[in-house]
């Protein structure tokens, strides 16, 4: 079938890199500057993405290949082949329509991307507190009463001062 | 193609202004989130200001709040930054660039941003 088909179709002889030019007998052309295929036997070059403003070229354009973009310093890559650049942010923040906001109290962010999470309730495990939570650290789930020897006391520190935090929204 | 293309850049002394415009074609403008982002010399990209479909929620960053303005005519497929008491810490490339179609809690990427516009800030 390949071969019968190869007979028929003369385009189906062009290698990536190169389309099957209807203007000129069906030969196969180089694809143009700037342009690519990434399989044998189209018709036309694709476009190369561009990499420019908020994206930065990890990988040129070849012949036979697209461009890859990541994301300037600042920004990282979201979607797809980094569809799209979002603003960092530090740990202990996240991001919101007005740029980047502390995490409220009660909640943490160890990341530089992503939402602000609630510290783990340690009293649902039946544990204490080991180690006080903040902006950009979880708490430290410690033993439970009852796993500590007798005479041993809790090693629950008191619950922090409030802190001012920012609401999202 | 998607494509915006900025102007209106210059060299301008401090506490004077200037007005940025970005021209957008190839996509339906109105429908989409803009933002303004800069890059100062030898400094990673910042977010400056973004403003909703409608022009009804804009956002800034703290350092240019109350001094810069973000707006949009829908109708001319066009976003400007009016920027006013420029500082030497100015001093950048700004970029506009588009936004979601809409914003959820996470995510506020861009998806394309033009060539740039110079802005530079003297004494």
């Known amino acids: 079938f390949e071969r019968t088909r190869s007979l028929q179709d003369p385009c189906s002889n062009c290698p990536a890199g190169t389309f099957c030019d209807n203007n000129r007998n069906q030969i196969c052309s180089p694809c143009p500057p700037n342009s690519f295929s990434s399989a044998g036997g189209q018709r036309t070059c694709d476009i190369c993405r561009q990499c420019k403003g908020v994206f930065r070229t990890r990988k040129e354009c070849s012949s036979t290949s697209n461009a890859e973009c990541d994301c300037t310093p600042g920004f990282h890559c979201l979607g797809a082949g980094c569809s799209m650049c979002e603003q960092d942010c530090k740990q202990g923040q996240e991001l919101t329509k007005k740029g980047c906001k502390d995490c409220c109290f009660g909640t943490f962010n160890d990341q530089k991307r992503g939402i602000c999470r609630p510290w783990t309730n340690c009293s649902l495990d039946g544990k204490s507190v080991l180690v006080n939570g903040t902006k950009e650290r979880d708490v430290v789930c410690g033993p439970s009463p009852a796993d500590l020897s007798p005479g041993a006391s809790s090693v629950t520190p008191p619950a922090p001062a409030r802190e001012p935090g920012h609401s999202p929204q | 193609e998607v494509q915006l293309v900025e102007s209106g850049g210059g060299l301008v002394q401090i506490g004077g202004s200037l007005r940025l415009s970005c021209v957008a074609s190839g996509f339906t403008f109105s429908k989409y989130w803009m933002i303004w982002v800069r890059q100062a010399p030898e400094k990673g990209l910042e977010w400056?200001?973004?403003?909703?479909?409608?022009?009804?929620?804009?956002y800034y960053v703290d350092s240019v709040e109350g001094r810069f303005t973000i707006s949009r005519d829908n109708a001319n497929n066009s976003l400007y930054l009016q920027m006013n008491s420029l500082r030497a810490e100015d001093t950048a490339v700004y970029y506009c660039a588009r936004g979601g179609d809409d914003y959820s809690h996470s995510h506020y990427g861009m998806d394309v941003s033009g060539q740039g516009t110079t802005v530079t800030v003297s004494s």
């Open positions: 400056v200001a973004n403003i909703n479909q409608d022009g009804s929620e804009k």
